[in-house]
């Protein structure tokens, strides 16, 4: 019997009946055994087929078989109801071998030419299975020349049988207080040959409760207890199960904080598995009762281990633990059934005693000493000499613990000194130099420091003066001896003030004329305002209307008098404003350089002379009455004049303050 070629040589060839293409003889029997490599099959087809036709091919035939199975018995030329001829059919071996038998009987009614066939080895696609047959692989099948292999989806591993996919279902740990777990693929059939371990591990103090839900279907046996697939539940106290079948197991109260669930499956079966919903319980903590003026959140029917609540106070109340304020409060239930922190109190917010208001006072409106939430206090300033700036002085104790004004300010109101108050009443006439009386010029400041000079009080901690009067002390402000509240230059009874800083106008050049002859002194402390110490007002925008030519201003100081000595008593003089061109012309002739009088100056005095400020008055204020506000304001600062004070045809020259309002305001606001 001829054999096909041995592999690994190519397996292919031709078969033919004896004598082909001539007729075959009687009583012939030929057998060919073809063998392909493992993983291959043989393909055979006929290019010529002409055999005697007989009932069920009993006479002459070609029989194809593979192993024990007969694939076909062929005869004739074309197929009939009971006989088969190959026609264009292709035949395949079931394995890697194919037997071909040719037989002719003792006679032929007419000559038949037999057959010619060709064969070849080809790869078997093991992944192709007939309908109804079990798949080659559990998950994925991969064909290749001479064989195949299986692989698994993520979460599975190939079993050692190389076909089954076992679930990678161990090592899952559930730590939440409740959750769900199920057999792999639930509710689809669970995988074969798997061993699953699930752990529920909660904090000590919790007890796990297991409920089987929806459906339960695990392969069982009518006589033996769960011999194939089973589910077991293990705690540190006891074991539950094994479970199998179709009945939902009852709830399991484990009384344990750790549970191990084991699920084992064999190689067969088609069952949907199980699903467990687990919850937990613990010893409850005492129900939290909210403190007065507070509430608990969240509100629960009971609070067990790890549950927490917070306390929130009503508006106007604050959390206190003992006497200490808490930003927030949260208590956590512990495993022994106690809360980890004691309940706080919601205590009414207390704004505390209000701060003292300099030059003012505070009055309790709600009740004596009441400083709690919504209490009202009223600040007011000392009458006559101070006025309240910013707000109306009414403050309420708000929920944030601050006294707050009706405008929402938390800072104190400011008692600002009233400016421009004087005891003096003026007529329209020009008087000679006269002694000042108490309260006439309460803004008058005496400046000692090398020479005698003057200044005017602004607010309660600034002095306005001439730059030339304090130029020498600009770098040694503390050397200035500043006195106020007195009429007598040499009196021991005065209010002492000291300088913190001296600000000389940046446009002033010493010994080069008197343009920009203006300076400010910042006092190191605020002075107390009274009838003898009151600031002068700064000019309003409209002040020019009270400073026209021939309007009367008043200069005051302790400067030289007609006798040639410094005045012992504060003196003052009422003098008219002089036309600017007239004044400029008066100082155009020698010994005065051209341009001595600038637009930053104003002149005052009599053409006939006799009334003037003089040395020692420098820096003092030339003041005017604002008839609308009935307050005095500073229009000029004593600056310079003729060598001989009060000389006819010459005038006193004063720094024009209204030109310097922005400069003054900037210095004061910045420092």
């Amino acid at each position: 019997t001829p054999l096909g070629p041995k592999w690994p040589e190519p397996v292919f060839g031709r078969l033919a009946s004896p004598g082909f293409p001539g007729e075959y003889a009687n009583d012939q029997e030929r057998r060919w055994t073809l063998t392909a490599p493992p993983g291959y099959r043989l393909r055979l087809y006929f290019t010529h087929f002409d055999l005697e036709l007989s009932h069920l091919c009993e006479y002459d035939f070609v029989k194809l078989s593979s192993g024990a199975k007969v694939l076909a018995t062929l005869c004739g030329q074309e197929s009939t109801d009971t006989e088969r001829a190959p026609g264009k059919d292709t035949f395949y071996s079931l394995g890697s071998s194919l037997d071909i038998t040719f037989r002719s009987d003792y006679s032929n009614e007419k000559p038949f030419t037999g057959f010619e066939a060709f064969y070849a080895a080809e790869d078997i696609d093991e992944c192709q299975v007939a309908p109804g047959e079990a798949p080659t692989c559990d998950h994925h099948c991969h064909n290749h020349l001479g064989g195949f292999y299986c692989s698994c989806r993520a979460g599975y591993v190939l079993h050692r049988n190389k076909r089954t996919c076992s679930a990678l279902c161990s090592g899952q740990v559930f730590t939440q207080r409740s959750g769900e777990l199920s057999s792999p693929e639930y509710p689809r059939p669970y995988p074969k040959l798997s061993s699953c371990t699930y752990s529920i591990s909660l904090e000590e103090g919790f007890s796990v409760i297991l409920d089987f839900v929806e459906s339960f279907d695990v392969e069982t046996h009518p006589e033996t207890l769960c011999p194939y697939d089973f589910l077991k539940i293990q705690t540190d106290r006891e074991e539950h199960g094994p479970f199998c079948g179709k009945t939902l197991p009852h709830r399991i109260e484990t009384k344990s904080n750790t549970v191990t669930i084991t699920f084992v499956t064999d190689e067969s079966g088609d069952h949907t598995g199980w699903k467990i919903h687990y919850t937990s319980t613990a010893q409850p903590c005492p129900y939290p009762m909210a403190p007065p003026n507070g509430h608990v959140s969240p509100v629960q029917a009971k609070y067990i281990l790890k549950d927490s609540f917070s306390i929130f106070c009503e508006t106007g109340y604050e959390l206190l633990q003992g006497h200490l304020p808490l930003k927030s409060f949260t208590a956590v239930c512990q495993k022994d059934g106690s809360w980890d922190r004691p309940m706080p109190a919601c205590s009414i917010v207390d704004c505390g005693p209000p701060d003292d208001l300099p030059s003012g006072r505070v009055e309790y409106i709600t009740g004596p000493g009441v400083t709690t939430y919504k209490a009202v206090i009223q600040y007011s300033c000392e009458e006559t000499f101070y006025t309240m700036k910013v707000n109306d002085g009414k403050y309420v104790c708000e929920a944030d613990g601050f006294w707050t004004s009706s405008k929402g300010e938390k800072s104190l109101p400011v008692c600002e000194p009233v400016c421009g108050l004087s005891a003096r009443t003026t007529g329209g006439r020009i008087y000679g130099g006269q002694k000042a009386k108490p309260g006439d010029f309460p803004w008058q400041v005496l400046i000692l420091g090398g020479t005698t000079a003057a200044g005017a009080l602004l607010y309660d901690n600034w002095v306005l003066t001439a730059a030339h009067a304090v130029y020498e002390q600009k770098h040694d402000a503390s050397a200035l001896d500043i006195r106020m509240g007195t009429l007598k230059r040499l009196s021991p009874h005065y209010t002492q003030a000291w300088s913190e800083a001296v600000f000389i106008h940046e446009g002033y050049t010493h010994d080069a004329g008197f343009d920009n002859d203006i300076a400010l002194i910042k006092l190191n402390n605020k002075v107390v305002i009274n009838s003898n110490i009151t600031p002068i007002c700064l000019p309003r925008k409209e002040a020019e209307s009270f400073m026209r030519t021939d309007d009367i201003g008043t200069a005051s100081g302790w400067g030289l008098t007609q006798r040639g000595f410094l005045a012992r008593n504060l003196m003052y003089v009422d003098i008219p404003i002089v036309d600017h061109q007239k004044c400029t012309a008066a100082y155009e002739k020698p010994p005065y350089p051209r341009g001595s009088v600038t637009a930053n100056m104003l002149c005052a005095g009599l053409e006939s002379g006799g009334k003037d400020s003089c040395r020692g008055d420098s820096g003092g204020a030339l003041v005017f009455l604002d008839s609308e506000t009935e307050r005095w304001f500073v229009g000029g600062i004593v600056s310079w004049g003729s060598m001989n004070c009060g000389e006819a045809g010459q005038y006193g020259v004063y720094t024009k303050v209204i030109n310097y309002i922005p400069w003054i305001e900037n210095i004061i606001s910045d420092f």
Epitope: L320, Q321, G322, H323, L324, P325, L326, K327, S328, T330, R341, S347, D350, G352, G401
Partner: antibody, heavy 118, light 106 residues
């Protein structure tokens, strides 16, 4: 005007007991939410809270020194007393008493330097 | 006892902003307090309950506290602000201080 003043020995021997007195004025030890705290500061080191007492007589101590500390108050004398037993050279520090209000230690005494040495 | 951690030192130029931090576990859930101490002097409370300024403390001092960090910010730092700064918080009725930050104004 709130003031607090510490008084007590400037030198103590090891193993002895330190008694410090804080005399307060300008606020009451018997009403409101005020408290008095003792804080110490070893030379060149940080502040270290020791104990406090409130108007309600609620007391609290530093955990690590609890067994050695006692705080008390005498409302009639406006005084708070701290005793510290078994003194050791490492307890050398400036000891401050201070007022607690709204959780903040808002007024402090000038402090008293206590040296522990044999 | 919980620990409050501060940087040991911080240097700023005059006029610059200084931010001093204090960190501790869940510090933002508690109130933070800040103290200034100049050499040879007692400490002074400069900030209470995270961001409240006691009267007399300049507006350039501000505070914040969230998460694990409280911050004291001094905007427009001046030479007079050179000092040691300590943070403090209350934990179960006991006070805890930070190790202090030495602020140097260059």
């Amino acid at each position: 005007q709130v003031t607090l003043k510490e008084s007590g020995p400037v030198l103590v021997k090891p193993t002895e007991t330190l008694t410090l007195t804080c005399t307060v004025s300008g606020f009451s030890l018997s009403r409101g939410k005020m408290g008095v705290s003792w804080i110490r500061q070893p030379p060149g080191k940080a502040l270290e809270w020791l104990a406090h007492i409130f108007s309600s007589d609620e007391k609290s101590y530093r955990t690590s020194l609890k067994s050695r500390l006692t705080i008390s108050k005498d409302t009639s004398k406006n005084q708070v007393v701290l005793t510290m037993t078994n003194m050791d050279p490492v307890d050398t520090a400036t000891y401050y008493c201070a007022r607690i209000r709204a959780g903040g230690i808002d007024y402090w005494g000038q402090g008293t330097l206590v040296t522990v040495s044999s | 006892q919980p620990v409050l951690t501060q940087p040991p030192s911080l240097s700023v130029s005059p006029g610059q902003t200084a931010s001093i931090t204090c960190s501790g576990e869940k510090l933002g859930d508690k109130y933070a307090y800040w103290y200034q101490q100049k050499p040879g002097q007692s400490p002074v409370l400069v900030m209470y309950q995270d961001k409240q300024r006691p009267s007399g403390i300049p507006e350039r001092f501000s505070g914040s506290n969230s998460g694990n960090t409280a911050t004291l910010t001094i905007s427009g730092t001046q030479a007079m602000d050179e000092a040691d700064y300590y943070c403090q918080a209350w934990d179960s009725s006991t006070a805890v201080f930070g190790g202090g930050t030495k602020l140097t104004v260059l």
